[in-house]
């Protein structure tokens, strides 16, 4: 179906887990389009009102990235154009845990996908051979 | 267009409480943050904190943490300044402001005169 | 809490001038620098957010600059509805600190 003249896209993202204190990853994916410039990547967190961060023609804008998430996020730069659009959260805290949208805007169309993002001190489990 | 109205001036006694109003329209009430800045007579611009609409949740400044208390009330598209243990160095303009990063637009001001 | 220190606290110019106000942040705040206007009696009035980005409806006389601890606002040619206090503020982490403004008046 049509989006303000655009079709939908398939966005595809995976539930995760952070462990605080260390730096985390919240994976998202789309179909790729050809030229980086007409690539809009946003993430957004339920309950926030700002931007987690968003990425457009090429380059971060953060001008209205909310400031919980200052200097903490950082998307694959040299990977959006084959359609990662994963975010890397530094420095995880216990306040990141919740529900994130991945927004994608490319010249095909747009397209969603949420993912619910859980914090925790995780520790690797122990294999015994 | 967006707008923000505050109710108006107040004169209180040291040790009272005042509660001003800040009531939003022309946007989304949820959609951005709201903040509250004062300004003493003749003084410059005091960041007072901030309440998020959408859950209620406040961050304040430093220094007024325990007399300052900032709520919101969804279905009038209102938010309220609480400031309680008044002095007479509360006496100033209370604003209120609409932003994420920056604030635009700001209220009219409540002039809010701490007197014995 | 980071500190923001406005310069110069007061200036007189005339119509016509070219007149520059200067922010410094006490830390960097990359480019979270917002600069408003305030008239005698009226509430501040955004003119520049995101340190260089011109807020719908301001004249283009009005500009910023700068990135990181340093800032600058400046006005091409003073018209007179342009004698104000002008106050810079950060955005980079809470409290959104205020500088403490600068007063311009007409020669």
């Known amino acids: 179906f049509g989006i303000s003249g655009r079709h939908s896209i398939t966005v595809t993202t995976v539930a995760s887990a952070g462990n605080i204190g260390e730096d985390g990853i919240l994976s998202c994916t789309f179909e790729p389009d050809i030229k980086l410039s007409d690539i809009v990547i946003q993430w957004l967190k339920e309950g926030v009102l700002g931007l987690v961060h968003e990425f457009k023609e090429g380059k971060d804008e953060l001008s209205e990235q909310d400031e919980m998430f200052r200097g903490r996020t950082a998307v694959f730069a040299d990977q959006v154009i084959v359609g990662n659009a994963s975010l890397r959260l530094k420095n995880v805290q216990l306040t990141d845990a919740g529900t994130y949208k991945c927004y994608i805007i490319t010249s095909k169309g747009k397209g969603n996908a949420n993912l619910e993002y859980k914090t925790g001190a995780f520790s690797m489990p122990e294999v015994n051979v | 267009q967006v707008q923000l109205v505050q109710s108006g001036a107040e004169v209180k006694k040291p040790g009272a409480s005042v509660k001003v109003s800040c009531k939003a329209s022309g946007y989304t009430f949820t959609a951005q943050y709201m903040y509250w800045v004062r300004q003493a007579p003749g003084q410059g611009l005091e960041w007072m904190g901030r309440?998020?609409?959408?859950?209620?949740?406040?961050v304040y400044a430093q220094k007024l943490q325990g007399r300052v208390t900032m709520t919101r009330d969804t279905s009038t598209s209102t938010v309220y300044m609480e400031l309680s243990s008044l002095r007479s160095e509360d006496t100033a303009v209370y604003y209120c402001?609409?932003?994420?990063?920056?604030?635009?637009?700001w209220g009219q001001g409540t002039l809010v005169t701490v007197s014995s | 809490d980071i500190q923001m220190t406005q310069s110069p606290s007061s200036l007189s110019a005339s119509v016509g001038d070219r007149v520059t106000i200067t922010c410094q942040a006490s830390?960097?705040?990359?480019?979270?620098i917002n600069w408003y206007q305030q008239k005698p009696g009226k509430a501040p009035k955004l003119l520049i957010y995101a340190a260089s980005r011109l807020q719908s409806g301001v004249p283009s006389r009005f500009s910023g600059s700068g990135s990181g601890t340093d800032f600058t606002l400046t006005i091409s040619s003073l018209q007179p509805e342009d004698f104000a206090t002008y106050y810079c503020?950060?955005?980079?982490?809470?409290?959104?600190?205020f500088g403490q403004g600068t007063k311009l008046e007409i020669k």
């Open positions: 309440i998020n609409p959408t859950s209620g949740n406040t």
């Open positions: 503020q950060q955005s980079y982490r809470s409290p959104f600190t």
């Open positions: 402001a609409r932003g994420i990063n920056w604030f635009d637009p």
């Open positions: 830390q960097d705040i990359s480019n979270y």
